[in-house]
């Protein structure tokens, strides 16, 4: 109770009090004062005595304490996806009697919904409210409405107003949780078949058979088979085990295999599921494409006088394919190339780079040409080798060794002699010259014998015809 | 309409062999696979194996291999199964069907 | 090879009643689960293919759900003539199986 100072200027003083007057109370004189937060409601009981007839006992004294912030209080909830649910009590709650009950309280909307609305019951749908009356709430007009699309939660926050009273709740955030619905259909973006090997088994890449959903998994959308008019499908790691369906993940492991038989065109007709949808009536080719195999025939040996150029022909090299291809489009092409000479076009400056790809038509044409390179020492016979690899796409490469035999053994036009060297001699008229190992050298008749053992043979000439006009 | 008519009851002696048709009719042959069942009596239904009518690869169940061969002749539209060396326990009912859907009538086995 | 569990092995219901057969797979089969009917001396009658479609000519009473390894036919409201043996039939992968069957009796 406030009572005065005893002096004019001393300041009323706040003292506790068990009993107080009528005047009390209409001088203002009587306070409550709250002192326990969050306990908004308080009560306390009097006996009320005039001195006339008898006193009035336990009169209840209710008092509600305005709390400084309206309390609102917010549930969070759970939605459908692209469904309503709406905002009514215990969901949205002012506590206590007194807020409610005022015909000012509104709700503000600090921060809308951002993959909703919050709309009332009856009024236009087109976008969400800034505001609305705790009335409305009541009325159970004021709903939450999702907006369909692939979200898993969404929020909003609130204000609840008091405008007489200049009083306001702090902002109270609901969280709002979306429950998935499959509503989108499964939707097949490419089709493009299957081109592979007549008997091979290959993988259908993701690449030739793909589907979306906007609202499952690669591992939810499922295709489903009937027979296959020219094969089987089989998973990577069973290829016994035949199945009618597998699944976008699948296809993209690169675990779906088809395993061609029977005819060259042919596939299978499927539909596509997410569980919830079916996509029938679709077909995915398949085409196999006969092997087309490469073979080499012709000696792959070619024989070579010392120091001279010989053309490579079809006794040596001939390429043929099954599909009886072109000779111009069987490609060869040197991997490692000659180490006693080289490989030379006939129509191409021969001083150039080494030969990397011919042509099997440029075989049967003569004009590859192997070129011997005479070496210093002198030799016998010598063997080199072409290491090649035959190509015509599709088949396969095949790869093929051309052995080269050197040898002063085989006849040479070229080259009458089969010695190392025999140059003959100039000699001026009725004088004599010397016969020297430049001019005359058979020492390589002696190449076959080990270096250490060579100075215990000696070659020997033997003259079978004397010069005619001279002597030795 | 859609037919599967499959050949009559048979009487054999273990060690004979039997051939079983099924003549389809209705639709188009090489489209949907033919399958074959065994229906043994106080016994449940058991698939035996099938064949893809369209590249005649025919596949079997684990309990029938060897003995059993499914085979087809495209131009008459009709897949066989044929049973060697017949013995008591291959008593049963044999029933063809082609895309879950459509049945044969049955084909009574008698081994004895 | 995949194994299918048909339960109960025997039902015994009355006129009206609904019931739920049962069948589970070893491992995924896709929604590949046909259900058929079988009555004596008779070809099996496909009520249901890839788990839950309908199948025309056969009564709305028979329905199918389930997806993964789970599966289950409802019969709405019972009716003596549905007294047979129910199979389930994986087609999903080679070699096929069926399941043991449900034998439904009507009270």
């Known amino acids: 109770m406030v009572s005065r100072g005893a002096l004019a200027d001393e300041p009323p003083s706040l003292d506790p009090v068990q009993s107080f007057s009528q005047e009390a109370v209409d001088t203002g004189r009587v306070l409550y004062l709250h002192s326990r937060p969050e306990a908004w409601s308080d009560a306390f009981s009097l006996d009320v005595a005039s001195g006339l007839g008898a006193p009035l006992e336990g009169v209840l004294v209710e008092l509600e304490v305005l709390p400084a912030a309206i309390p609102l209080e917010a549930q969070n909830f759970s939605v459908p996806e692209g469904g309503s649910l709406t905002l009514a009590p215990p969901l949205l709650r002012v506590s206590g009697p007194y807020f409610p009950t005022l015909l000012g309280l509104s709700l503000q909307v600090l921060e809308p919904p951002q993959h909703g609305a919050l709309q009332k019951e009856d009024g236009p749908q087109a976008r969400t409210l800034s505001a609305f009356s705790w009335r409305m709430v009541e009325e159970q007009l004021i709903r939450y409405v999702h907006d369909g699309s692939e979200t898993l939660t969404d929020s909003f926050v609130l204000m609840a107003n008091a405008s007489e009273m200049d009083r306001q709740s702090h902002p109270v955030a609901f969280t709002v949780t979306v429950l998935p619905v499959n509503d989108q259909p499964p939707i097949l973006t490419t089709n493009t078949g299957l081109q592979m090997w007549e008997g091979a088994t290959a993988p259908i890449p993701a690449e030739a058979l793909r589907s979306t959903d906007g609202d499952s998994g690669s591992e939810d959308l499922v295709y489903t088979i009937e027979q296959p008019s020219n094969g089987r499908v089989v998973l990577r790691g069973a290829p016994g085990t035949e199945v009618r369906s597998f699944t976008q993940a699948q296809l993209d492991g690169g675990l779906v295999l088809f395993s061609h038989r029977g005819t060259l065109d042919g596939g299978f007709r499927f539909r596509l599921s997410d569980g919830e949808h079916t996509s029938p009536g679709h077909f995915f080719r398949v085409t196999a494409q006969k092997q087309v195999l490469l073979s080499l025939k012709g000696s792959q040996t070619l024989t070579v006088c010392p120091g001279s150029v010989q053309p490579l022909s079809s006794q040596t090299l001939r390429a043929s394919s099954s599909a009886g291809t072109d000779p111009q489009l069987l490609l060869y092409r040197v991997v490692r190339g000659p180490q006693l000479g080289r490989l030379f076009h006939a129509q191409q400056d021969s001083t150039g780079e080494a030969l990397v790809n011919f042509t099997q038509a440029e075989v049967y044409a003569g004009n590859i040409l192997y070129e011997h390179e005479m070496p210093p020492e002198p030799f016998w016979e010598a063997h080199d080798t072409l290491e090649l690899q035959l190509s015509s796409p599709p088949a396969r490469d095949v790869a093929a060794t051309l052995a080269v035999a050197v040898s002063f053994e085989a006849a040479c036009p070229q080259r009458p002699s089969h010695l190392w060297k025999n140059k003959g001699l100039w000699v001026p008229e009725g004088q004599r010259a010397r016969i020297t190992v430049a001019a005359l050298d058979a020492s390589n008749l002696l190449a076959s014998v080990p270096s250490p053992q060579r100075s215990e043979h000696d070659v020997l000439f033997q003259v079978t015809q004397f010069p005619s006009r001279g002597q030795l | 309409q859609i037919q599967l008519v499959q050949s009559g009851p048979e009487l054999k002696k273990p060690g004979e062999t039997v051939k079983i048709s099924c003549k389809a009719s209705g639709y188009t042959f090489t489209d949907y696979s033919m399958h074959w069942v065994k229906k043994t009596p106080g016994k449940g239904l058991k698939w035996l194996g099938w064949?893809?009518?369209?590249?005649?690869?025919?596949t079997y169940a684990d309990d029938f291999k060897g003995r059993f061969a499914i085979s087809l002749e495209t131009s008459a539209r009709t897949v066989y199964l044929q049973i060697n060396n017949l013995r008591n326990e291959d008593t049963a009912t044999y029933f063809c069907?082609?895309?879950?859907?459509?049945w044969g009538q049955g084909t009574t086995l008698t081994v004895s | 090879d995949i194994k299918l569990s048909q339960s109960p092995s025997i039902l015994s219901v009355t006129p009206g009643e609904t019931v739920s057969l049962s069948c589970r797979a070893s491992?995924?089969?896709?929604?590949?689960l046909h259900w058929y009917q079988q009555k004596s001396h008779r070809s099996p009658r496909l009520l249901i293919k890839?788990?839950?479609d309908s199948i025309s000519g056969i009564p709305s009473r028979f329905t199918g759900s389930g997806s993964g390894t789970d599966y289950t036919l409802n019969i709405n409201s019972v009716k003596p003539e549905d007294e047979g043996i129910y199979y389930c039939?994986?087609?999903?992968?080679?070699?096929?199986?069926f399941g043991g069957g449900t034998k439904l009796e009507i009270k």
């Open positions: 064949i893809n009518t369209a590249t005649g690869e025919p």
């Open positions: 491992q995924t089969i896709y929604k590949n």
């Open positions: 890839y788990g839950s």
């Open positions: 069907f082609s895309y879950y859907d459509y």
């Open positions: 039939l994986q087609g999903y992968s080679t070699p096929w199986t």
